[in-house]
């Protein structure tokens, strides 16, 4: 570590005095100190001498000697006071810049340590400090305003009491900068824009930050637009707004618009798309199949997506039959807006009844005209079965009628004993009817089929059962021949009640 002579921490001299500061180290040594006049520097190997034969108040400050070759970076320091009765302060800076909540050192160096008891910090023109200004003083370094606030950005003077009167330093400007958390916040409105050629349009790009030093621009398809900027300050934020007004849009105005803002922390950008169209449009679509099949008693939501410009002037859901003239309840119709030009309309059909099968149409209107999208709703039913004994062309025949949707399949079973339903152990014979006769098949209705089983002789201690099934469920009917004629048994658990 270098050694300074005189070997005292501080030295007090009068103006005009000769001062010699000598530093000696193992290798070459160097001096650093405040900017001040009249010093002469002599270097000779491992020693360096700072000297002046005319010390002034401006030489007041801390002089540090370092040894550049020292890997430990050791240094020695001495503080020099040049006590000028007319100049109690040596101010080392015109301006101090700190961030909010940092300590701000105002470098007024006291030229005479005796004056320390009567020092104070004031704002220029003798104004008192703002309330809650917390500061401390060091004769070597000056006044420190602790945890400086933006509002404390002022011009300050250091004051010392000399012979009963206050003597001020030259002023120091304090600039307290707000801490910038990141790039400016951005908004670009609208998020999407559609206009018909010839209409007017407005796009607004705005950025805000706690600090005024930021830039914002609007670009169209990577071309920066020259737009006058409006500036404002509110809610403790600086705001810069760029407004693009287009009186009559044309196709060349269409495309991507980006709002870009940057500051020392970085850059933010956000984009929107502007579409220019020849005329009004109205498009209806659905992600669902337009032909729907639902089991009776269950619910269904019909959804339509609408893309339109200009906005809709009217819309509604309509039931087109064929079962009744009822219309969907308005409370079951719901509209949600995805964005300015896209909407979703939903019709909720809970616990569907047979009379609610049929066509449902969504109609919408805007200046571009009417559009409709129609759903066809068919209900699914489990089969209902009935069996009768009859003679056809002189032959005894069991006739099974099955009704349901989708079209039921028919299977005949013959089993021993009298039973409501044949079980596996009892089955004597099974006949599948791959092509039962379709008796009725109208849209949105059940399909009724008929299957014939010709029986030469009815066995009296046996049961004949007709079973029908489809994707929804199954139904059956047992026919038991008895001596007094024929007897039929629907199943105990009747599967369906219309």
């Amino acid at each position: 570590i270098p050694v300074i002579e005189p070997s005292v921490p501080e030295l007090v001299v009068k103006p005009g005095a000769t001062v010699t500061l000598r530093c000696v180290g193992n290798g070459s040594v160097e001096w650093d100190g405040p900017p001040s006049p009249h010093w002469t520097l002599y270097s000779d190997g491992s020693s360096s001498i700072l000297s002046t034969n005319n010390a002034t108040f401006q030489n007041t400050g801390t002089y540090r000697c370092t040894e550049p070759g020292d890997p430990l970076g050791g240094s020695a320091a001495i503080h020099l006071y040049v006590k000028d009765p007319a100049r109690p302060w040596n101010v080392l800076a015109q301006e101090v810049v700190v961030f909010e909540d940092q300590d701000a050192l105002l470098p007024c160096l006291l030229t005479d340590p005796v004056l320390e008891a009567g020092v104070s910090l004031v704002r220029v023109r003798g104004r008192p400090l703002m309330r809650h200004t917390n500061y401390s003083f060091s004769p070597w370094h000056g006044f420190t305003i602790h945890r400086a606030k933006f509002i404390q950005s002022q011009d300050y003077q250091c004051s010392a009491l000399m012979g009963g009167r206050k003597v001020m330093s030259i002023s120091i400007r304090l600039k307290v900068q707000k801490v910038i958390p990141g790039p400016p916040a951005l908004t670009l409105v609208p998020a999407e824009l559609v206009r018909i050629r010839g209409e007017a349009a407005q796009i607004v790009c705005s950025a805000s930050s706690v600090d005024v030093n930021f830039d914002v621009f609007l670009q169209h398809n990577n071309t920066k637009l020259a737009i006058p900027q409006q500036s404002d300050f509110h809610n403790n934020r600086y705001q810069k707004v760029l407004t693009l007004n287009l009186d009559q849009v044309d196709f060349q105005h269409a495309g991507n618009y980006s709002c870009v803002a940057s500051n020392v922390q970085g850059k933010h950008s956000t984009s929107m798309f502007f579409r220019v169209v020849e005329s009004a449009y109205l498009n209806l679509s659905s992600e669902q199949n337009l032909i729907q099949e639902v089991t009776v008693g269950e619910g269904l939501n019909l959804k339509v997506m609408v893309e339109a410009y200009p906005g809709l002037q009217g819309f509604n859901w309509t039931y087109l039959g064929p079962f009744s003239d009822h219309q969907p309840e308005p409370k079951l119709a719901n509209a949600t807006t995805k964005d300015t030009y896209r909407h979703t309309f939903t019709l909720s059909l809970p616990r569907l009844k047979p009379s609610e099968a049929g066509r449902y149409s969504f109609l919408a209107r805007n200046p571009g005209g009417w559009r409709a999208l129609t759903f066809e709703l068919t209900l699914r039913y489990p089969p209902e079965v009935s069996v009768i004994w009859t003679f056809i062309n002189g032959s005894g025949t069991l006739l099974c009628a099955a009704s349901g949707y989708p079209q039921p399949n028919v299977t005949w079973l013959q089993c021993s004993g009298h039973t409501d339903r044949c079980d596996e152990a009892q089955v004597l014979q099974v006949w599948d009817d791959p092509y039962p006769e379709v008796l009725s098949q109208e849209p949105f209705h059940k399909v009724t089929v008929q299957s014939l089983l010709t029986v030469e002789t009815l066995e009296h201690n046996q049961t004949y059962e007709c079973r029908a099934h489809n994707s929804v469920g199954s139904g059956s009917w047992a026919f038991i021949p008895i001596s007094a004629g024929a007897h039929t048994h629907p199943p105990d658990e009747f599967l369906f009640t219309p």
């Epitope: 160097e30 650093d32 900017p35 001040s36 010093w39 800076a93 810049v97």
Partner: antibody, heavy 116, light 108 residues
Framework: QVQLQESGPGLVKPSETLSLTCTVS????????WSWIRQPPGKGLEWIGY??????TKNPSLKSRVTISVDTSKNQFSLKLSSVTAADTAVYYC???????????WGQGTTVTVSS | EIVLTQSPGTLSLSPGERATLSCRAS???????LAWYQQKPGQAPRLLIY???SRATGIPDRFSGSGSGTDFTLTISRLEPEDFAVYYC?????????FGQGTKLEIK
């Protein structure tokens, strides 16, 4: 071995603010005075100002437009020059300034053009 | 502010010759606060001399400085090819710290 590196945008629009940063490596920013100097194309050197800790002194010809600040946590100091015009087009240098030795370490310089 | 005037504006010499560059101040300055810098095209200035006469670290001894008050001189005793550049004097004793307009040393 102290080294300096300037950084910042190479193009600034008239009336906007020029912002440059000088990153100090190989030494503590708290130990010395640090300066900004500029050199217009084909011309001489002009001293802009210096900073020590957070206190700065500036060239009166630029004083009202210049802010010099320091960020000790990043070992950086910065220059802001507001309301720029074409006359502010120059190579901007940062340098270490020592009161008895002059400007002994310089950055390589960064070119700033003021143009719309 | 202190104005520094350098002369000549351009100096044309051959390698091996002696170069003498002058710097005159508009008012007296302490010799402790005068520096000389060398600048080559596309490069930052480099400190040659501080305190009017002390060589900076790594500067060859063919470079020397002298003077006091208002007149200062940079001398290059024997020009090497790498010495052809622009030279600036600067005073750093009184704010604003000013530079001379430069002397261009070119090969004859």
């Amino acid at each position: 071995q102290v080294q300096l590196q300037e950084s910042g945008p190479g193009l600034v629009k008239p009336s906007e603010t020029l912002s440059l940063t000088c990153t100090v490596s190989g030494g503590s920013i708290s130990s010395y005075y640090w300066s900004w100097i500029r050199q217009p194309p084909g011309k001489g050197l002009e001293w802009i100002g210096y900073i020590y800790y957070s206190g700065s002194t500036k060239n009166p010809s630029l004083k009202s437009r210049v802010t010099i600040s320091v960020d000790t946590s990043k070992n950086q100091f910065s220059l802001k020059l507001s309301s720029v015009t074409a006359a502010d087009t120059a190579v901007y240098y940062c340098a270490r300034w020592r009161t008895f030795y002059g400007m002994d370490v310089w950055g390589q310089g960064t070119t700033v053009t003021v143009s719309s | 502010e202190i104005v520094l005037t350098q002369s000549p504006g351009t100096l044309s010499l051959s390698p091996g010759e002696r170069a003498t560059l002058s710097c005159r101040a508009s008012q007296s300055i302490s010799s402790s606060y005068l520096a000389w810098y060398q600048q080559k095209p596309g490069q930052a200035p480099r400190l040659l001399i501080y305190g009017a006469s002390s060589r900076a670290t790594g500067i060859p001894d063919r470079f020397s400085g002298s003077g006091s008050g208002t007149d200062f001189t940079l001398t290059i005793s024997r020009l090497e090819p790498e010495d052809f550049a622009v030279y600036y004097c600067q005073q750093y004793g009184s704010s604003p710290y000013t530079f001379g307009q430069g002397t261009k040393l070119e090969i004859k």
